[in-house]
């Protein structure tokens, strides 16, 4: 039950990539507005996105306080222009979100190959260490800072003239691979958190190939 003409939010969904975290829901409001509250399992509710006509709310600032905590959000529905009005039970209609643990569930963003350098038959490939919105001592942490050795990168590399993708793995942001002399190679990387059971992989980075600007070649 609830106030006449007010409908409860539904399909509450967390959308999160590299800890940038937005709660989305339905329906688009007709003569109603929403307010979101978020809390840890043991904490107090904090209100966000007051009386909004949006169907999303950016909760990044809250979840980055402790990305290993489990969060719950709820979306309250109020009649437009009468936000003090409550339902028949004495409080506004609301719907709970699924629980969300950022460290375990945030999607890994698409990585970027920062550079590659060939020295003889070795190539060093470096992955950009992307900055997140997680803060410590007033500085933003990188993905590596947050995940540490839980985060690995898989490198796919192949001769420009062939289709078979060899792989290499690292728990740093650098690869050192063997290549055949005189051959051009292409590279793509994928971020992986093997200890997860879902959302383990990122999408692949854009492909970078030798003979393009990003790389450097040195004959030894």
């Amino acid at each position: 039950s609830g106030t006449t003409n007010t409908v409860a939010a539904y399909n509450l969904t967390w959308k999160s990539t590299n800890f940038k975290t937005i709660l989305e829901w339905e329906p688009k409001p007709v003569n109603q507005v929403y307010t979101v509250q978020i809390s840890t399992k043991s904490g107090d509710w904090k209100s966000k996105c007051f009386y909004t006509t949006d169907t999303e709310c950016d909760l990044t600032d809250e979840i980055v306080k402790d990305v290993k905590q489990t969060y719950l959000a709820r979306v309250f529905s109020y009649p437009a222009g009468n936000v003090e009005s409550t339902g028949s039970a004495g409080e506004p209609l609301y719907e709970n979100s699924p629980e969300f643990t950022p460290y375990l569930e945030t999607n890994l963003g698409q990585p970027t190959i920062q550079s590659f350098e060939q020295v003889g038959t070795k190539v060093n490939v470096t992955v950009e260490d992307e900055r997140t919105l997680v803060r410590r001592n007033n500085t933003f942490l990188s993905l590596r800072d947050v995940f540490g050795k839980d985060l690995i990168y898989t490198l796919y590399y192949w001769k420009s003239s062939s289709s078979g993708k060899k792989t290499a793995k690292t728990n740093t942001n650098e690869f050192l691979i063997d290549v055949d002399k005189g051959e051009n190679y292409c590279f793509s990387v994928q971020a992986v958190i093997p200890s997860r059971t879902v959302n383990r992989k990122s999408t692949d980075s854009p492909v970078e190939c030798m003979g393009q600007e990003k790389g450097e070649f040195r004959e030894i």
Epitope: I152, T154, Y156, S163, G164, K165, K166, T167, A168, K169, T170, N171, D178, Q190, V192, P194, S195, R196, T197, V198, N199, R200, K201, T203, D204
Partner: antibody, heavy 120, light 107 residues
Framework: EVQLVESGGGLVQPGGSLRLSCAAS????????IHWVRQAPGKGLEWVGY????????YYADSVKGRFTISADTSRNTAYLQMNSLRAEDTAVYYC?????????????WGQGTLVTVSS | DIQMTQSPSSLSASVGDRVTITCRAS??????VAWYQQKPGKAPKLLIY???FLYSGVPSRFSGSRSGTDFTLTISSLQPEDFATYYC?????????FGQGTKVEIK
């Protein structure tokens, strides 16, 4: 419970084709990598190839390159091994296995295998 | 491709014996070596990963070690259910490669 079940094996003539399936349950294949490994009667294990179902990337052993193709249907949570131009030396039990994908752990779960016999 | 040379190809032992199987990689593979146990008509089972770590549910009589490019699987006290074939595998580079296998038989 993680499970891999191979099917599609059987008797085929030299030069013929066969498609093996590897149906996965208890995990989502696009979050992992799937390998095919074979074992000729009385012989050791031979790696055939892998697929990353999330992007379709593959790599094959030299012995099967150009004849075998690995694919995946993520909606069915199933990987496939298409074998063409089969030879007597391809006779083996074919296993699919899940690659955990960490630096430390590779093939952590295997299917029960399916026998492929190439003979006239 | 990296070769994994496994020895011996077979051995006979009695229940309670200490058994050692070795694998030598043709080049550096760091610790990216696994050991598998296979019984007749069955799929291989992971025993040891990352050269020396015991996989979940595997009895503690199994252990693995590394010295450079040499890798060892040890069964401290052979049990009746341990009679099987054992394989090493490197997954440091593509393609991954297996050793030839060691058949552990009853003396």
């Amino acid at each position: 419970e993680v499970q891999l079940v191979e099917s599609g094996g059987g008797l085929v003539q030299p030069g013929g084709s066969l498609r093996l399936s590897c149906a996965a349950s208890g995990f989502t294949i696009s979050d992992y990598w799937i390998h095919w490994v074979r074992q000729a009667p009385g012989k050791g294990l031979e790696w055939v190839g892998y697929i990353d179902p999330s992007n379709g990337y593959t790599y094959y052993a030299d012995s099967v390159k150009g004849r075998f193709t690995i694919s995946a249907d993520t909606s069915r949570n199933t990987a496939y091994l298409q074998m063409n131009s089969l030879r007597a030396e391809d006779t083996a039990v074919y296993y699919c296995a899940r690659d955990y994908g960490s630096l430390e752990v590779s093939l952590d779960y295997w299917g029960q295998g399916t026998l492929v016999t190439v003979s006239s | 491709d990296i070769q994994m040379t496994q020895s011996p190809s077979s051995l006979s032992a009695s229940v309670g014996d200490r058994v050692t199987i070795t694998c030598r990689a043709s080049q550096d593979v760091n610790t990216a070596v696994a050991w598998y146990q296979q019984k007749p008509g069955k799929a291989p089972k992971l025993l040891i990963y990352s050269a020396s770590f015991l996989y979940s549910g595997v009895p503690s009589r199994f252990s693995g070690s590394r010295s450079g490019t040499d890798f060892t699987l040890t069964i401290s006290s052979l049990q009746p259910e341990d009679f099987a074939t054992y394989y090493c595998q490197q997954h440091y580079t593509t393609p991954p490669t297996f050793g030839q296998g060691t058949k552990v038989e009853i003396k």
